[in-house]
Interface confidence: medium
Amino acid sequence: FKVATLYSLYVCPEGQNVTLTCRVFGPVDKGHDVTFYKTWYRSSRGEVQTCSERRPIRNLTFQDLHLHHGGHQAANTSHDLAQRHGLESASDHHGNFSITMRNLTLLDSGLYCCLVVEIRHHHSEHRVHGAMELQVQTGKDAPSSCVAYPSSSQESENITAA
């Protein structure tokens, strides 16, 4: 399987909400022996590998923000810890996997990584990640709502979080 980032850059005004999204695609084994662990973290663009270093998002580690389920099942973080920090990660039946950040501040700007680990019990773990940039802007140059720039083309799209 692979992970695709729908957008490589999100530009948002301060105070807005944004949902960063990754999609898992390709063959997904739905057997009892296979589960998926999905999470988010902040990182930096390393010289060797992007998303190598795992930094917290608003003081929450990748362990705090994880989802764990079998196949393309729906799941979301319901624990108070994430919600107290204005965060919620979710996964749907179609392989979409997202994190919603509420009330953005300039400190939220940076590189965000989604991580998916396919766990085949008694055999192996296969892990892949996707990366995207979030720029939070303030002042007259800031957009009125979030603008997302697709990974594969230059056309932008206005988005708002639920």
Partner: antibody, heavy 118, light 106 residues
Framework: EVQLQQSGPELVKPGASMKISCKAS????????MNWVKQSHVKNLEWIGL????????SYNQKFKGKATLTVDKSSSTAYMELLSLTSEDSAVYYC???????????WGQGTSVTVSS | QIVLTQSPAIMSASPGEKVTMTCSAS?????MYWYQQKPGSSPRLLIY???NLASGVPLRFSGSGSGTSYSLTISRMEAEDAATYYC?????????FGSGTKLEIK
């Protein structure tokens, strides 16, 4: 504060069985796997196996199948390892350690010393 | 199973000296992890994903490598670094550790 508190040292007779406990606190128990590691003078560190409190799934090092049985009690956030038919080769320090998938064992218990002797 | 061979088995270094130890895997692994253990204590995570420092680990520690060859470096040896260091792989079951490198202070 993340803590893994293991049960105390054990002196057991050959052929007997015993159970070590590992009580977790300070984190979401079901968000990690609980791993068990054996440390003896002969073999240094050996991974015994893991259990996922999320779904009770286990994975064992083939070498320890039939020797170790891993279980969890989610209600008390406690992991257990039962060691069966003990021999002198099972004398060692046993550690529990938590691990998030795709990561490493970032917190370890203090270790439980097991001595098998008649 | 993947066998991890660490070398040297024992080494000593003076304070301020640069220290490098290696871990060789019998088959290619995606990432390497390093742990430090002092006598009477539990292992402590030092390096994850080959080159990233775990929380609270001093910047004098670094990791590198790929495929079957990995290394752990201490840029300037300090007395508190005297310990045994283990490499470990999570790429395939059963997960395995190296036999350890014991680092002593001169």
């Amino acid at each position: 504060e993340v803590q893994l508190q293991q049960s105390g040292p054990e002196l057991v007779k050959p052929g007997a069985s015993m159970k070590i406990s590992c009580k977790a606190s300070g984190f979401s128990f079901t968000g990690y796997t609980m791993n068990w590691v054996k440390q003896s003078h002969v073999k240094n560190l050996e991974w015994i196996g893991l259990i996922s409190p999320y779904n009770g799934g286990t994975s064992y090092n083939q070498k320890f199948k039939g020797k170790a049985t891993l279980t969890v009690d989610k209600s008390s956030s406690t992991a257990y390892m039962e060691l069966l038919s003990l021999t002198s080769e099972d004398s060692a320090v046993y550690y529990c350690a938590r691990r998030a998938y795709g990561y490493a064992m970032d917190y370890w218990g203090q270790g439980t010393s097991v001595t098998v002797s008649s | 199973q993947i066998v991890l061979t660490q070398s040297p088995a024992i080494m000593s270094a003076s304070p301020g000296e640069k220290v490098t130890m290696t871990c060789s895997a019998s088959s290619s692994v995606s990432y390497m992890y390093w742990y430090q253990q002092k006598p009477g204590s539990s292992p402590r995570l030092l390096i994850y994903d080959t080159s990233n420092l775990a929380s609270g680990v001093p910047l004098r520690f670094s990791g590198s490598g790929s495929g079957t060859s990995y290394s752990l470096t201490i840029s300037r040896m300090e007395a508190e670094d005297a310990a045994t260091y283990y490499c470990q792989q999570w790429s395939s079951y059963p997960f395995t550790f190296g036999s350890g490198t014991k680092l002593e202070i001169k």
